[in-house]
C-alpha cells in the first residue's frame, strides 16, 4: 500500500436545503483506471461511512441507490455533493481515495472538510 496526497477544503457550510458540495483532489502518481472514493464522517470520536463509489477514469461516479451522495469526476478531481443534511449531521467529512487498478494500490486520506449544517427556521404562519 502506497501513500497518496488528498486535498479537500477545510470548511463548507451546507445550504438551507441541507446540501453541501466540496471538491476532493488527489495527486495521482500514475495512470489509474479504476478509482474508489469513500466519504467518512467523524463526529463524537466515531468514524462512520457516508457513501462510496468506484468509477473508471473518464466515467461518472455511480453511488448506490438511496445514497445521500452524488458526484462527478474530472481528471484527478472529484466533485462531491451530499444531500439531506440536518443540523445533527454537522461533522468532519473525510475524503478517502483508493487507486484500485492497475497496481500498485495507492491510498490517500484527506484531512477532512468540516461541514456545518443549520436547520432552517420554520416559516411563520401567513394570512396570504
Amino acid at each position: 500500500c502506497k501513500a497518496m496526497h488528498v486535498a479537500q477544503p477545510a470548511v463548507v457550510l451546507a445550504s438551507s436545503r441541507g446540501i453541501a458540495s466540496f471538491v476532493c483532489e488527489y495527486a495521482s502518481p500514475g495512470k489509474a483506471t479504476e478509482v474508489r472514493v469513500t466519504v467518512l464522517r467523524q463526529a463524537d470520536s466515531q468514524v462512520t461511512e457516508v457513501c462510496a463509489a468506484t468509477y473508471m477514469m473518464g466515467n461518472e461516479l455511480t453511488f448506490l441507490d438511496d445514497s445521500i451522495c452524488t458526484g462527478t469526476s474530472s481528471g484527478n478531481q472529484v466533485n462531491l455533493t451530499i444531500q439531506g443534511l440536518r443540523a445533527m449531521d454537522t461533522g468532519l467529512y473525510i475524503c478517502k481515495v483508493e487507486l484500485m487498478y492497475p497496481p500498485p494500490y495507492y491510498l490517500g486520506i484527506g484531512n477532512g472538510t468540516q461541514i456545518y449544517v443549520i436547520d432552517p427556521e420554520p416559516c411563520p404562519d401567513s394570512d396570504f
Epitope: 457516508v50 462510496a52 438511496d66
Partner: antibody, heavy 123, light 106 residues
C-alpha cells in the same frame, strides 16, 4: 435468495480469540453492510459492529479494543475476531445484512439474518 | 451512547387483543426498526424506517413515532405473534436495542 450463515468453533477457551465467519449469498458485499449482533443466553440483543459496503468498519465502543471485522469480497465472506474472551462473551452470534452506509435516504434495517451460532467460552 | 428503554418488559394478552409496545430513547433519533424473535430463532425484521412494513409482514403490525418516543402496534394479536419484540435505533453509533418485550398468552 438472500442468505447468511455463521460458522466457527462452538467452544473457545478463556483469554483466547473467538473467530467467526459469515458467508453470504444472494447479494454483494459491495452493495450492503454486514452487521454483527450477539445475544447472551436468556438476554437481549447487543450490536457488536459493522463493515460497510466501502470496507470501513465501526465497532461498539465497549468492545473496540478487542474486536476486528474484515471481509473478503471475492469469497463473499465477512469475519469477526474477538480477542481475550471471557465467560461474559458466551452468546449466540448473528450476522445480518443492513444498510451499505451509515447515512442513507432510507432503508434503515437489518433485513436478513443468519441462523446464529452459539459460542461458549469455557476452559 | 443512546439508551433504548422498552416497555413493558412483558405482557399477557389474548388472541384478538390490540397490543402496544413503546420504546423511549435518551435522545432524539431519526429512524427506528422493530424485530420479532421466537425462541431458538434469529430476529425477524418487522418495521423499518420507523413506519414501513417489511416484506411479507402482516398489515396488523404498524410502527409510529418521532423524536424520542416510538411505538409498535399489533392491531389484532394472532397465535403466531407470541414472541419477544425488540426496538433498535439507527440515529447514531453504536447502534442500540431495547431490552425486549415478551408477549405471552393470557
Amino acid at each position: 435468495q438472500v442468505q447468511l450463515q455463521e460458522s466457527g468453533p462452538g467452544l473457545v477457551k478463556p483469554s483466547q480469540t473467538l473467530s467467526l465467519t459469515c458467508t453470504v449469498s444472494g447479494f454483494s458485499l459491495t452493495s450492503y453492510g454486514v452487521y454483527w449482533v450477539r445475544q447472551p443466553p436468556g438476554k437481549g440483543l447487543e450490536w457488536l459492529g459493522v463493515i460497510w459496503a466501502g470496507g470501513t468498519t465501526n465497532y461498539n465502543s465497549a468492545l473496540m479494543s478487542r474486536l476486528t471485522i474484515s471481509k473478503d469480497t471475492s469469497k463473499n465472506q465477512v469475519s469477526l475476531k474477538l480477542s481475550s474472551v471471557t465467560a461474559a462473551d458466551t452468546a449466540v452470534y448473528y450476522c445480518a445484512r443492513g444498510p451499505p452506509h451509515a447515512m442513507m435516504k432510507r432503508g434503515y434495517a437489518m433485513d436478513y439474518w443468519g441462523q446464529g451460532t452459539l459460542v461458549t467460552v469455557s476452559s | 451512547d443512546i439508551q433504548m428503554t422498552q416497555s413493558p418488559s412483558s405482557l399477557s394478552a389474548s388472541v384478538g387483543d390490540r397490543v402496544t409496545i413503546t420504546c423511549s430513547a435518551t435522545s432524539s433519533i431519526t429512524y427506528m426498526s422493530w424485530y420479532q424473535q421466537k425462541p431458538g430463532k434469529a430476529p425477524k425484521l418487522l418495521i423499518y424506517d420507523t413506519s414501513n412494513l417489511a416484506s411479507g409482514v402482516p398489515s396488523r403490525f404498524s410502527g409510529s413515532g418521532s423524536g424520542t418516543d416510538y411505538t409498535l402496534t399489533i392491531s389484532s394479536l394472532q397465535p403466531e405473534d407470541f414472541a419477544t419484540y425488540y426496538c433498535q435505533q439507527w440515529s447514531s453509533y453504536p447502534l442500540t436495542f431495547g431490552g425486549g418485550t415478551k408477549v405471552e398468552i393470557k
